[in-house]
């Protein structure tokens, strides 16, 4: 369960891939599309508000008692819109919704690299946000070796 309903911290950052492509958001036909693209020099990067929540891992699963804490994040590129995992379509979508947010909007934060993060679906363990054909998609990671796969690694930057 997520500890409390308010985030422990919030962080406004631009999101880019391991290969330094930017994640951008465009309003098209009253809905937002998500793109993975190379920005031109000096082109402004889109910012995402990351809200960090503590989540207690159930002690019967972890063996940690009260010690098994995970860090969950929600990602909001614009007011009232959040990234959602659509597990049926294996897609990542922007949905407008009110709080409390649904579980599909929460992602377990991983560091597989000192300056990169990965986002694992709360609703589908082992499935991560990744890059596929210049779009964000949900990618199944079937072994710990594949956790370092570049297409699920993202960089957060304040600039």
């Amino acid at each position: 369960s997520i500890t409390g309903i308010s985030p422990i911290t919030e962080y406004l950052a631009s999101l880019s891939t391991y290969n330094d492509q930017s994640i951008t958001f465009a309003l098209e036909d009253e809905s937002y599309e998500i793109y993975v693209e190379d920005l031109k020099k000096d082109e402004k990067k889109d910012k995402v508000l990351l809200s960090y929540y503590e989540s207690q891992h159930p002690s019967n699963e972890s063996g940690d008692g009260v010690d098994g804490k995970m860090l969950m994040v929600t990602l909001s590129p614009t007011k009232d819109f959040w990234l959602h995992a659509n597990n049926k379509e294996h897609s990542v979508e922007l949905h407008k919704c009110e709080k409390p947010l649904p579980d599909q909007a929460f992602f377990v934060l991983h560091n597989m690299h000192s300056n990169c993060v990965s986002f694992e679906c709360k609703t589908d363990p082992g499935v991560f946000i990744g890059v596929k054909d210049n779009h964000l998609a949900l990618i199944k990671v079937d072994s710990s070796e594949n956790l370092c796969t570049e297409n699920i690694l993202f960089k957060l930057s304040e600039t």
Epitope: I8, T9, D64, L109, N111, M112, V117, E145, C148
Partner: antibody, heavy 122, light 107 residues
Framework: EVQLVESGGGLVQPGGSLRLSCAAS????????MTWVRQAPGKGLEWVAS????????YYPDSVKGRFTISRDNAKSSLYLQMNSLRAEDTAVYYC???????????????WGQGTLVTVSS | DIQMTQSPSSLSASVGDRVTITCLAS??????LAWYQQKPGKAPKSLIY???RLQDGVPSRFSGSGSGTDFTLTISSLQPEDFATYFC?????????FGGGTKVEIK
């Protein structure tokens, strides 16, 4: 109860090697990043090495890079620090620490071992 | 590298005093900042994480604040067991770095 117990410290000559161990218990070891931090006598704290929860990534400051190697055995819930080409300035108490959350580095080090003293002297 | 400058390096205070320790970073970063307390011959103990979150079991007289480059640890009413050395640490960018420490002594 989370426990981290370091061992392997001692007196070693300059240029020598030493292997520190940290036995972890009371938590799911393979879900956490682990880190070594050291403290020279009468001085402050210095980060020495970190390793990802899977063991696939390792990180070091320039002061120890190429000389120290951090590793882990998740099956044994153990963390190691192989120290080669030791110098007088490596003399310190070495602490084994555990990250705050599963899978990531955020939130500092809530758990520390008691430390093991490494003395590099001829 | 992010340099963490703690001030003061030492201070003298009495039981009941309000004590403030600051940590200044050489560049701004997300609020992945922790504070530790250390007593002679002992391992450091985590007090605060995420700049302002109290670690489990830490008395509420300890509090943390700040963001960007300026961070503060406050002890609202100093107790006898609080005389120790305090360190800040940033975890936002590698290499991980600590402040030089602040020794809180009895006046």
């Amino acid at each position: 109860e989370v426990q981290l117990v370091e061992s392997g410290g001692g007196l070693v000559q300059p240029g020598g090697s030493l292997r520190l161990s940290c036995a972890a218990s009371g938590f799911t070891f393979n879900n956490y990043w682990m880190t070594w931090v050291r403290q020279a006598p009468g001085k402050g704290l210095e980060w020495v090495a970190s390793i990802t929860y899977t063991g696939g990534g390792t990180y070091y400051p320039d002061s120890v890079k190429g000389r120290f190697t951090i590793s882990r055995d998740n099956a044994k819930s153990s963390l190691y620090l192989q120290m080669n080409s030791l110098r007088a300035e490596d003399t310190a108490v070495y602490y084994c620490t555990r990250a705050n959350y599963y899978y990531n580095t955020y939130g500092g080090f809530p758990y520390w071992g008691q430390g093991t003293l490494v003395t590099v002297s001829s | 590298d992010i340099q963490m400058t703690q001030s003061p390096s030492s201070l003298s205070a009495s039981v009941g005093d309000r004590v403030t320790i600051t940590c200044l970073a050489s560049e701004g970063f997300s609020n992945d900042l922790a504070w530790y307390q250390q007593k002679p011959g002992k391992a450091p103990k985590s007090l605060i994480y995420a700049a302002s979150r109290l670690q489990d079991g830490v008395p509420s007289r300890f509090s943390g604040s700040g963001s960007g480059t300026d961070f503060t640890l406050t002890i609202s009413s100093l107790q006898p067991e609080d005389f120790a050395t305090y360190f800040c640490q940033q975890g936002s960018k590698y290499p991980l770095t600590f402040g030089g420490g602040t020794k809180v002594e009895i006046k």
